[in-house]
Amino acid sequence: DSEEDEEHTIITDTELPPLKLMHSFCAFKADDGPCKAIMKRFFFNIFTRQCEEFIYGGCEGNQNRFESLEECKKMCTRDNANRIIKTTLQQEKPDFCFLEEDPGICRGYITRYFYNNQTKQCERFKYGGCLGNMNNFETLEECKNICEDGPNGFQVDNYGTQLNAVNNSLTPQSTKVPSLFEFHGPSWCLTPADRGLCRANENRFYYNSVIGKCRPFKYSGCGGNENNFTSKQECLRACKKGFIQRISKGGLIKTKRKRKKQRVKIAYEEIFVKNM
């Protein structure tokens, strides 16, 4: 086992049945938000499969936040009787592997990969940059790891940490950044400043992903790209918190090396994007 392998593996004490989430937001990490209040709230922990308490700061955060333990349980847990342990090989894959490729409605054409259930292989497609569905991967390897069967009929690798697109927005995820960090913010935070083609000189800010800071630039008033903010605060809020240290709190669970690796299987809620 290399260190890199372990970094991307979720290891748990016991064999758990596949986790089928009732709502995709139940997979979000607990997010206390940027504010400083101390409010007792509850979130669903996908690793322990239980609703747990956390301290919420009072603003922002995400949907995996509930006023009471009961509300959390109602939204994110199923009765054990209703938990169907999937056994067939086809069902080992996440549900989204069986969705048709969907380029989405936007026009920022990006090369992505999808699992083609007809050919049983991951294939390239052009993604428009927004919406679409979860059968959409940045790399061929990622697609193969999550959706293709290995030579012995089992999944090639675990996908327990593939939680960066758990809603149906499928906004562009990042290109790769230095190894200690992962970028989970909008992909345009990684693009260079672009003045655009007009003649105005508007004061704007862009996120410089090399130095990790928001910097001013002069915007021409039209065109350019999305890495363009009217204030430094806006820029920081959109891009700065996208950089997450892999070893920070809420990161990956690690225990002793020799335990059996367990994939955390997550079946996302249906998104209702159909091919006609």
């Epitope: 937001f25 922002e60 995400n62 949907q63 969907d102 380029p103 409605i105 936007c106 026009r107 920022g108 428009g128 940059g129 927004c130 919406l131 809603n167 149906n168 927005s169 906004t171 562009p172 913010g185 909008p186 345009w188 790209n225 999305e226 363009n228 903010f229 009217t230 806006e234 959109a238 998104i271 209702f272 994007v273 159909k274 091919n275 006609m276």
Partner: antibody, heavy 124, light 107 residues
Framework: QVQLQQSGPGLVKPSQTLSLTCAIS??????????WGWIRQSPGRGLEWLGL?????????AYAVSVKSRITINPDTSKNQFSLQLNSVTPEDTAVYYC??????????????WGQGTLVTVSS | DIQMTQSPSSLSASVGDRVTITCRAS??????LHWYQQKPGKAPKLLIY???TLQSGVPSRFSGSGSGTDFTLTISSLQPEDFATYYC?????????FGQGTKVEIK
């Protein structure tokens, strides 16, 4: 200049099918630059997105969960128009229905052109 | 679904006033937010897309800001033709959802 012209009946009986058409001028229903959709507005519900279609070498659609089992949006390339069908209507479906063009930029999609609106009343 | 909450639901202002309308999303939506203006009996009209980009032909007195969960539409100097209802709408994921609207009335 893109324009959308809506047509269809203003009165539909409960349990029947609501059918509206949106004729496009100045753009093509098969355009690769965006899509076409329907939104409705009622005093009780405000503005409610119903669904959209778009063409990217084949047709795709996305529907609101609230109407998913009852809705169909279809393109008609020969007439350069698209239609809304909403089955099994009830008085709660009474609203002003708008068709709209969804323009897709690099990362955004927004309704930049709207039809004039059609008040549809569901009543026996 | 992502809930969009606008405040205030209505406001009274005079010509020349600076008006600010806020929109809050129930979860982070980056800058996938658009603003529309609607006058009685008319279809909504796009003002701003992507939280801060002014739609072509819209006067520069309109501006938008924000990202994540909190967004603002500002009219720097209210004109007679600006008395209308304003809606925010998210595009972060299906279904697209709108705020309940903010009605700007003459004081």
């Amino acid at each position: 200049q893109v324009q959308l012209q809506q047509s269809g009946p203003g009165l539909v009986k409960p349990s029947q099918t609501l059918s509206l058409t949106c004729a496009i001028s100045g753009d093509s229903v098969s355009s690769n630059s965006g899509g076409w959709g329907w939104i409705r507005q009622s005093p009780g519900r405000g503005l409610e997105w119903l669904g959209l279609i778009y063409y990217r070498s084949k047709w795709y659609n996305a529907y609101a969960v609230s109407v998913k089992s009852r809705i169909t949006i279809n393109p008609d390339t020969s007439k350069n128009q698209f239609s809304l069908q909403l089955n099994s209507v009830t008085p709660e479906d009474t609203a002003v229905y708008y068709c709209a063009r969804y323009l897709g930029s690099n990362f955004y999609v927004y309704s930049d052109v709207w039809g004039q609106g059609t008040l549809v009343t569901v009543s026996s | 679904d992502i809930q969009m909450t606008q405040s205030p639901s209505s406001l009274s202002a005079s010509v020349g006033d600076r008006v600010t309308i806020t929109c809050r999303a129930s979860q982070g939506i980056s800058s996938y937010l658009h603003w529309y203006q609607q006058k009685p009996g008319k279809a909504p009209k796009l003002l701003i897309y992507g939280a801060s980009t002014l739609q072509s032909g819209v006067p520069s007195r309109f501006s938008g800001s924000g990202s994540g969960t909190d967004f603002t539409l500002t009219i720097s100097s209210l004109q007679p033709e600006d008395f209308a209802t304003y809606y925010c709408q998210q595009q972060n994921g299906y279904p697209f959802t709108f705020g309940q609207g903010t009605k700007v009335e003459i004081k």
